[in-house]
């Protein structure tokens, strides 16, 4: 199944003009994501059943080794490039989680809905970040890394990797919301 975010691998050829108050929109999207991140995390680990709800530190700690770094004290350009990488990583990871959860927890419709809503906001955020990078800094290409491929993992590993990613997401989105 296609991942929810396909990053643009392009020169600065923006099809539509950027929104007015682009940075305000980016801040608003980050605040929106930050406001719902904890609820998504709780919904996720609850849906996985035992042993997840009682072993959050062990199973859902934000131990994501290849997660793109973020430096809050950098220039706006540097922060936007790092934000772009993080959003691509989160988007592909969320796509994997959504695909896995539809198979592992087909009746957890509120979880599916929240995952899809989060992916939608991330898509919009990615578009806005790219617009800002292109229009102000003429950056049309950013090297990115993608979230781990969970397709060949067993049931427990799929659940655990998803939980760790959402734990990391909850943590990093708070940092990002503050940094912009």
């Amino acid at each position: 199944s296609p991942l929810p975010i396909t990053p643009v691998n392009a020169t600065c050829a923006i099809r539509h003009p950027c929104h007015n108050n682009l940075m305000n929109q980016i801040r608003s999207q980050l605040a929106q994501l930050n406001g719902s991140a904890n609820a998504l995390f709780i919904l996720y680990y609850t849906a996985q059943g035992e042993p997840f709800p009682n072993n959050l530190d062990k199973l859902c700690g934000p131990n994501v080794t290849d997660f793109p770094p973020f430096h809050a004290n950098g220039t706006e350009k540097a922060k936007l490039v790092e934000l772009y990488r993080i959003v691509v990583y989160l988007g592909t990871s969320l796509g994997n989680i959504t695909r896995d959860q539809k198979i592992l927890n087909p009746s957890a419709l509120s979880l599916h809905s929240k995952l899809n809503a989060t992916a939608d906001i991330l898509r919009g955020l990615l578009s806005n970040v790219l617009c800002r990078l292109c229009s102000k800094y003429h950056v049309g290409h950013v090297d990115v890394t993608y979230g781990p491929d969970t397709s060949g993992k067993d049931v427990f590993q799929k659940k655990k990797l998803g939980c760790q990613l959402l734990g990391k997401y909850k943590q990093i989105i708070a940092v990002l919301a503050q940094a912009f």
Epitope: G49, E50, P51, D100, I103, L104, D149, T150, S151, G152, K153, D154, V155, F156, Q157, K158
Partner: antibody
Framework: QVQLQESGPGLVKPSDTLSLTCTVS?????????WSWIRQPPGKGLEWIGY?????????YYNPSLKSRVTISVDTSKNQFSLKLSSVTAADTAVYYC????????????WGQGTLVTVSS | DIQMTQSPSSLSASVGDRVTITCRAS??????LNWYQQKPGKAPKLLIY???SLQSGVPSRFSGSGSGTDFTLTISSLQPEDFATYYC????????????FGGGTKVEIK
Amino acid sequence: QVQLQESGPGLVKPSDTLSLTCTVSGFSFSTDYWWSWIRQPPGKGLEWIGYIYVGTSGDTYYNPSLKSRVTISVDTSKNQFSLKLSSVTAADTAVYYCAGADNPYDYFNLWGQGTLVTVSS
Amino acid sequence: DIQMTQSPSSLSASVGDRVTITCRASETISGYLNWYQQKPGKAPKLLIYRASSLQSGVPSRFSGSGSGTDFTLTISSLQPEDFATYYCQQGYSYSDTDNVFGGGTKVEIK
């Protein structure tokens, strides 16, 4: 219909490497599937050896007690996957089954008929 | 490391009897427990998957129940063709797991 067929030598010398191949027919090997090897010593229960995922990640999981001696690989062009078990002893004498599991890979719904491998000099 | 323990290891029963086999996991496996039937010289055959779902073509006298750590396979009325060995298998975690199968239960004619 889908068929799995194990092939390989029925007799292997101690300390040698046991090599078996499973040929899958009537099935698109590129499909999201896990392929496993399972063995059964004479008169005993089933023992899971390991599996390989046929997909982008190519994940493999092995039984920890056999991990240092086991390699499972796949040849998608031939619709085959293989087992190699090194440094065999008489304790590795068993009927070896290949099996398949559909996403999310939690049960084995496809089985070969099994092949007996005897380790003896 | 999840260990699967099956009981009893063997039992004697008559045609028409109700037979119950249990399987216990050393830690929770949610509902990812499967049951197989094996006859001498044959490959195992999937009977029940994910604790309670009947595999296509399997008679309805076979049923499964349980979740978490404790699971049961029930044959409501034993038939002559049901004399075989039954195995449980956890499909939850293959990581660092020595064996995903239980030790087996041989159902013999009384």
